[in-house]
Structures are given as structure tokens and as C-alpha cells.
Interface confidence: medium
């Protein structure tokens, strides 16, 4: 869920999550256009693993999960089912690739309307 | 209570081999990562790298890269610091730290009692 | 590597009196940033975390302030305990590198 998302990022990464809540084309609700940085591009991948958890019957938005932040890294479980393990895994991810990157302020507060309609096909 | 003992006092010759010891004890010794820090005489302190406690993975600072190993015994709840081929600029109290790294909890909030090494001919 | 510098780098104060420190980064740490004591042959205690926490157990006349590449340490009405040196440790990305310090000394 939301929290967890939150929680991961914060592990991992240098910034507050809320760094990422407004940022770029893809980092927020929803999301279309070419991802404008290494940011926007975790954020991009990070969609298409919610999407791919969305189309296996879960919630990501709203699904919890067990996780522990050891030694700045996340540690997934212990899971409950198939769903929880997906989501953790989708956080740890984005979490993770966040961490490798450089803020770019000039994308925080992006205008959507900069946007493209379409968006990078899925992995 | 949570404690972090390290060996005691070492002194050596240019060229030999020390390792220092920092034993953890009152809390899960792979939840946290384990830091080095070197405080020369009359010093201010210095960073020297960190080992993920968990999986051993050791990260260490520009400028302590090469003679300097982090290791673990973590049956033992133990961190090593090996420095090879001493220097007399090695001369130092070296103190390990246990790191919190969990945003925005991030600090060394346990610290050993030092080592002192003296390096001498 | 971000580089962190604290001035001043001594400062002589009678007990009672308020001072100021302050720790200086090369790059936005955002509030990355922690706040140490070390007493002369001792281990550095931990103060604050994250610019402005109070770690557990550290009297309220101690306060951290300040974002991005510009902190401060409060210390109000001195008491003899609080003579030592002082430092900041930023944790952005690795090097978590350490302020040269400010030592706190008595007038």
C-alpha cells in the first residue's frame, strides 16, 4: 500500500517520499508522457509493476504487507500470499532505483499538461 | 542494554598487521550496519566506511580503500577493522558505531569505547 | 563527496550563556543531518538527528535547526557538561562525511 511505498523509499533512499509525490510525468497518481529523468523513469517502471500486480487480482494502492528496513535495504516478508510478495517487490524496486539517482528540481511541481499523451511501453 | 566493546590499546611497527575487534551486544546484530570511524590525535573525526551487517557487504571511504578490510564473526555479534602494511599516520583511536539508517532516523546512535593504535619504530 | 565545514572552529562561552554553531554543506542534504558531543577521551553521543530531532535522553536547551546546505546547534543556558567539541555528520549518499568540529571551551 501507500504506506509501505512511503516506508521503502524512505529505507532506502536519501530524500522524503514526499520528494517524489509531485514529480516529473510519472512520479504521483497516475501517469503518461516520456519520464523526464532517472527519477521519472523509476517512477515509470514502478506504474508498470503496479499494473502487472493489478492485472494478477491485487490492490496495490491499498494492500498491505510485512517488510523490515535492515541495514538500508528492504527486506520483504514474511508474506501472507502471492499479492503481498508482488507489491513488496514492486516498493523494493522503486525504492532501490530511487536511491541511484540525481534530484532535479526543476521537475518537482511538473505541469501535466508537458506531458505527451503516450507513455513508454511496459518491460 | 545495548553495548558495543572494542579491544584494547595496540601498539605496532610500520608494515605490520592489526585487527580490532567491536563486539555488539542487547540488540539484533544484523539489523543494523556497523560503521568505522578514525579520530587522529587532536583530530576531528573521520568516516571510514560502513559493512551491511546482514549480507557482509562492506563500503568504505575514498581514502581508506586498499589497506583497510571490514569483517564480521556475526555468530559472535562481532565487527572486525583490519588495516595491513601499518603507517605511522595510521596512529589513531578507531571507534565502530552502530548505524540506524531508517529515514529520517539516521544516525550512529551507539558508539564503542575506542582503540587506540599506535604506530612506531 | 559532499563536503561539510563548521564554523567557528573554537568558541569560549561561560555557563549560562546561549551560543550557536553552525555546519555548512557542499550540497542540499534536504535535513540529513545529525549533531554529535565528544568530551575529551570519550565517544561521541549522539544530540540530534535529522537537523532538528532531540535524541533520546538530550536536556531541551539543546536544539538543531536548519534544511538544506545551512545548519545550526542551539545551545541555551551553558551548563559545565556541555564544554567539549561538536560535530555534524550529514547522511545523504555515502561518504557520511563529518564536519572538522567546534570545540566548545570554557571562558
Known amino acids: 500500500g501507500i504506506l509501505e511505498l512511503a516506508g521503502t523509499v524512505g529505507c532506502v533512499g536519501p530524500r522524503t517520499p514526499i520528494a517524489y509525490m509531485k514529480y516529473g510525468c510519472f512520479c504521483g497518481l497516475g501517469g503518461h508522457g516520456q519520464p523526464r529523468d532517472a527519477i521519472d523513469w523509476c517512477c515509470h517502471g514502478h506504474d508498470c509493476c503496479y499494473t502487472r500486480a493489478e492485472e494478477a487480482g491485487c490492490s496495490p494502492k491499498t494492500e498491505r504487507y510485512s517488510w523490515q528496513c535492515v541495514n538500508q535495504s528492504v527486506l520483504c516478508g514474511p508474506a501472507e500470499n502471492k499479492c503481498q510478495e508482488l507489491l513488496c517487490k514492486c516498493d523494493q524496486e522503486i525504492a532501490n532505483c530511487l536511491a541511484q539517482t540525481e534530484y532535479n528540481l526543476k521537475y518537482l511541481f511538473y505541469p501535466q499538461f508537458l506531458c505527451e499523451p503516450d507513455s513508454p511501453k511496459c518491460d | 542494554q545495548i553495548q558495543l566493546v572494542q579491544s584494547g590499546p595496540e601498539l605496532k611497527k610500520p608494515g605490520e598487521t592489526v585487527k580490532i575487534s567491536c563486539k555488539a551486544s542487547?540488540?539484533?546484530?544484523?539489523?543494523?550496519?556497523m560503521n568505522w570511524v578514525k579520530q587522529a590525535p587532536g583530530k576531528g573525526l573521520k568516516w571510514m566506511g560502513w559493512i551491511k551487517t546482514n549480507t557482509g557487504e562492506p563500503t568504505y571511504a575514498e581514502e581508506f580503500k586498499g589497506r583497510f578490510a571490514f569483517s564480521l564473526e556475526t555468530s559472535a555479534s562481532t565487527a572486525y577493522l583490519q588495516i595491513n602494511n601499518l603507517k605511522n599516520e595510521d596512529t589513531a583511536t578507531y571507534f565502530c558505531?552502530?548505524?540506524?539508517?531508517?529515514?529520517?532516523?539516521?544516525?550512529?546512535?551507539?558508539w564503542g569505547q575506542g582503540t587506540t593504535l599506535t604506530v612506531s619504530s | 563527496d559532499i563536503q561539510m565545514s563548521q564554523s567557528p572552529a573554537s568558541l569560549s562561552a561561560s555557563v549560562g550563556e546561549t551560543v550557536t554553531m553552525t555546519c555548512r554543506a557542499s550540497e542540499n542534504l534536504y535535513s540529513n543531518l545529525a549533531w554529535y558531543q565528544q568530551k575529551q577521551g570519550k565517544s561521541p553521543q549522539l544530540l540530534v538527528y535529522?537537523?532538528?530531532n532531540l535524541a533520546d535522553g538530550v536536556p531541551s536547551r539543546f536544539s538543531g535547526s536548519g534544511s538544506g546546505t545551512q545548519f545550526s546547534l542551539k545551545i541555551n543556558s551553558l551548563q559545565p557538561e556541555d564544554f567539549g567539541s561538536y560535530y555534524c555528520?550529514?547522511?545523504?549518499?555515502?561518504?557520511?562525511?563529518f564536519g572538522g568540529g567546534t570545540k566548545l571551551e570554557i571562558k
Open positions: 555528520q550529514h547522511f545523504y549518499v555515502t561518504p557520511y562525511t
Open positions: 542487547g540488540y539484533t546484530f544484523t539489523n543494523y550496519g
Open positions: 558505531a552502530r548505524g540506524n539508517y531508517y529515514r529520517p532516523r539516521r544516525y550512529f546512535d551507539y
Open positions: 535529522a537537523a532538528t
